[in-house]
């Protein structure tokens, strides 16, 4: 075509998929008559008649683009409505009159790909590959044109290396005309890279301008061999006898290799494995002090079989062994003196302390507890505690009982109980001595006793309310090698009516069940009265 | 076109090695890894052992001590044995392309019975 | 190990049928899901990876959806050809099936 070769660039129209594009056609006046024009695509050079303008009223050529064609801007202007990939080409108006012009349009299609989608090697890689190894592909879905992918680690571009990265992408056109892109990175990895951040990056160009998009990071199973081997010991810190200690093989190689756990045994000079659990975890619960002494891990690779042992570690575990007092069994006469004196071992500085059982009151700082000029109230309970300062909990005791001899010593001198004619009363009368005494009543009824501690007794009687009764009163007596002595149970007829809730005289009704007929499950708990008792 | 065929025994006595053959055309075993997986009658699929397109590779820790796979990348060979076979160890034995991380074409599958 | 857990473990359903399996993995495994066919007496053969892209000469009727933990193979209209046990598999740390779904027609 004569002056094909001075034919001026076409106009450049960019449009996204599915949206519209406007072709208008840029002839002048001078070059040809709008309202008579030819509308042509241009398709590997060949050319075809898609649309007619005659007297300015369009009508569409069958085909392709039949449907989707329309002017706009009284003729001037050619509207492509739901632009495909496949509209990316030249499109030319022709005017008819006076000469024959044309004027051509390049029309540029684009689309935004999906996001990126990132896998990552699902077995991991070895640092110790002879090649490298595919470490994670990404799949950019429906784009046009093909978007360029970048690829980063720990937010810096990779670039190819001869035998430790390389980038292989290609890409399949769908049935849309859009473009799927995969990139696989394929690589050498270090140990290093077991922290490292993978991520790529889509590039693509939109009618508005250049755009981006990334993937989510990742991070790549690396495997390498293990070079070091430690024990950590949990809890931290010093140790005590009860504890749930666990001793942990650790590697700083991926997989863990294979642990085993041994004890030197002192006397042997020989390890002696341990058992422990799936894990590779030495579990003592609770701790010992046969525990103690010196461990250490071995790591095996089960592939080359080639073991690693760690640094041995010393572990203590600190005990108190049990208390020991002496004397074990005390007995004084009033007004002698006794030395009470604590022995333990400990792995760990010792301190004592002497208590009163009864009242937890601290006696003395230290292992000897001197006690002068004996009271019958000094009968009871002594307790020792041997603690390890160091080691908050650890600590053992021993509880020492100190007898005094002396007669009976009465709970009570004497005491009222309010009860109900021909209930079945259940009475108890208490008392302390040295020998221990017995306890026996004047009435006949269902004793029982029992021993409180080595120097009291309890004795308990269930015993019918007769009218006798209720004259006489019931009389207990306990008596030793050194005594007797006798506290006595006077009973007072309840009056239901008369008793008012604020009654003063009394502390109250004893809880009972009276039956007049049928004395089983008939019982009654006494109270003290309020005034204060004379013992002894 | 991309092909896989597994070959081996179908008959294994308890105890003995299983030794199975992945014969593979239409692609290159230094391009795309091989996976080793196998289904007991009427059961689900289970995944045994990988090697890559490097070379390195890879077991299911049910078996690992157990299993042995390499390739011979000059007779598009990748071979799997499995040790103290027992009858349990019945199944299909499959061997399947990686691509490159999920399998697109599979062997058509040997039948490995384990029995005295 | 990720565990894979299909749901349900058969159905009958009709011809033309829409058909759907579930497949629930026991942790996040982000997109990293292939579902596979297998017809009695059959090798497996994939039909879905990267949990929604259909593999080559698929039928568009088979699709993919999900992410994460819970993903979906659906048949849009059931034919009789597609008979076959379905299985879902994740290839985000190393590779676990789902234990099969049973597909017949009523």
């Known amino acids: 075509v004569p002056g094909e070769a001075e034919q001026p660039a076409p106009e450049l129209v960019e449009v996204e998929v599915g949206s519209t594009a406007l072709l208008k056609c840029g002839l002048s006046q001078s070059q040809g008559n709008l309202s008579h024009v030819d509308w042509f695509s241009v398709h590997k050079e060949k050319r075809t008649l898609i649309f007619r303008v005659r007297q300015g009223q369009g009508q569409s050529e069958p085909g392709e683009y039949e449907q989707r064609l329309s002017l706009q801007d009284r003729g001037a202007t050619l509207a492509l409505t739901q632009v495909t990939p496949q509209d990316e080409r030249i499109f030319l108006c022709q005017g008819k009159r006076p000469r024959s012009q044309e004027y051509r349009i390049q029309l540029r299609v684009y689309k935004a790909p999906e996001e990126p989608n990132i896998q990552v090697n699902p077995l991991g890689i070895p640092v110790n590959s002879k090649e490298p190894e595919e470490v994670a592909t990404c799949v950019g879905r429906n784009g046009y044109p093909i978007p360029q992918v970048i690829w980063y680690k720990n937010g810096r571009p990779l670039k190819e290396e001869k035998n430790r990265v390389h980038i292989q992408s290609s890409q399949t056109v769908e049935s849309s005309g859009l473009y799927t892109l995969q990139s696989i990175l394929k690589a050498q990895l270090v140990k290093e890279d077991k922290d490292a951040q993978f991520y790529c990056e889509l590039n693509y160009r939109l009618p508005s301008g250049n755009h981006m998009k990334e993937s989510r990071e990742v991070t790549v199973p690396v495997f390498y061999p293990t070079e070091k081997v430690w024990l950590e010991v949990e809890p931290v810190g010093m140790l005590k006898e009860g504890d749930r200690v666990e001793i942990r093989c650790l590697a700083d190689g991926n997989p863990p290799p294979h642990f085993s756990i041994s004890k030197g045994n002192p006397s042997t000079r020989e390890a002696e494995e341990e058992t422990t659990n799936d894990n590779g975890v030495l579990v003592l619960e609770p701790a010992r002090k046969e525990h103690s002494g010196r461990y250490e891990c071995q790591a095996w690779n089960l592939d080359t079989m080639i073991s690693l042992l760690s640094e041995p570690q010393e572990l203590l575990v600190n005990y108190v062994s049990d208390v020991r007092v002496s004397p074990a069994a005390p007995e004084r006469q009033e007004g002698s003196s006794l030395t009470l004196t604590c022995e333990a071992e400990s792995s760990q500085d010792l301190e004592f302390q002497w208590l009163r059982e009864e009242t937890d009151q601290v006696l003395e700082r230290g292992p000897v507890l001197q006690l002068h000029d004996l009271k019958r109230e000094a009968g009871g309970g002594y307790r020792c505690v041997a603690s390890v300062p160091s080691i908050p909990g650890l600590n053992r005791t021993q509880l020492v009982k100190l007898a005094i001899f002396g007669p009976p010593w009465m709970a009570f001198k004497e005491r009222k109980v309010w009860v109900k004619e021909n209930m079945v009363l259940n009475l108890s009368c208490e008392a302390s001595g040295h020998p221990r005494p017995t306890i026996s009543w004047n009435v006949n009824g269902t004793a029982s006793e029992g021993d409180q501690d080595p120097q009291r007794v309890l004795s308990t009687l269930n015993v019918l309310v007769t009218p006798e009764l209720l004259e006489t009163g019931v009389e207990c007596t306990a008596s030793n090698d050194l005594g007797k002595n006798t506290s006595i149970l006077f009973l007072e007829l309840v009056n239901l009516t008369t008793l008012t809730p604020d009654s003063n005289t009394t502390t109250g009704l004893s809880t009972s069940t009276a039956s007049p007929h049928t004395r089983a499950n008939s019982t009654s708990t006494e109270r003290k009265l309020p005034e204060p008792e004379s013992r002894g | 076109q991309v092909t896989l065929k597994e070959s081996g025994p179908v008959l294994v006595k308890p105890t003995e090695t299983l030794t199975l053959t992945c014969t593979v055309s239409?692609?290159?075993?230094?391009?795309?890894?091989v996976s080793w997986v196998r289904q007991p009658p009427g059961k689900a699929l289970e995944w045994i052992a990988a090697?890559?397109?490097?070379?390195?590779?890879y077991y299911n820790s049910a078996f690992k001590s157990r299993l042995t796979i390499s390739r011979d990348t000059s007779k598009s060979q990748v071979v799997l044995t499995m040790t103290n076979m027992d009858p349990v160890d019945t199944a299909t034995y499959y061997c399947?392309?990686?691509?490159?991380?999920?399998?697109?074409?599979w062997g058509q599958g040997t039948l490995v019975t384990v029995s005295s | 190990d990720i565990q894979m857990t299909q749901s349900p473990s058969s159905l009958s359903a009709s011809v033309g049928d829409r058909v759907t399996i579930n497949c629930k993995g026991s942790?996040?495994?982000?997109?990293?899901l292939a579902w596979f066919q297998q017809k009695p007496g059959k090798v497996p053969k994939l039909l879905i990876y990267?949990?929604?892209s259909l593999q080559t000469g698929i039928p568009s009727r088979f699709s993919g959806s999900g992410s994460g933990t819970d993903f979906t193979l659906t048949i849009s209209s059931l034919q009789p050809e597609d008979v076959a046990t379905y299985y879902c598999?994740?290839?985000?740390?190393?590779?676990?099936f789902g234990g099969g779904t049973k597909v017949e027609i009523k």
């Open positions: 090697i890559s397109s490097g070379g390195s590779t």
């Open positions: 239409g692609f290159s075993l230094t391009s795309n890894g």
């Open positions: 990267d949990a929604n």
């Open positions: 942790q996040n495994i982000y997109k990293s």
């Open positions: 598999q994740q290839y985000y740390s190393g590779y676990t």
């Open positions: 399947a392309r990686h691509r490159p991380f999920y399998f697109d074409y």
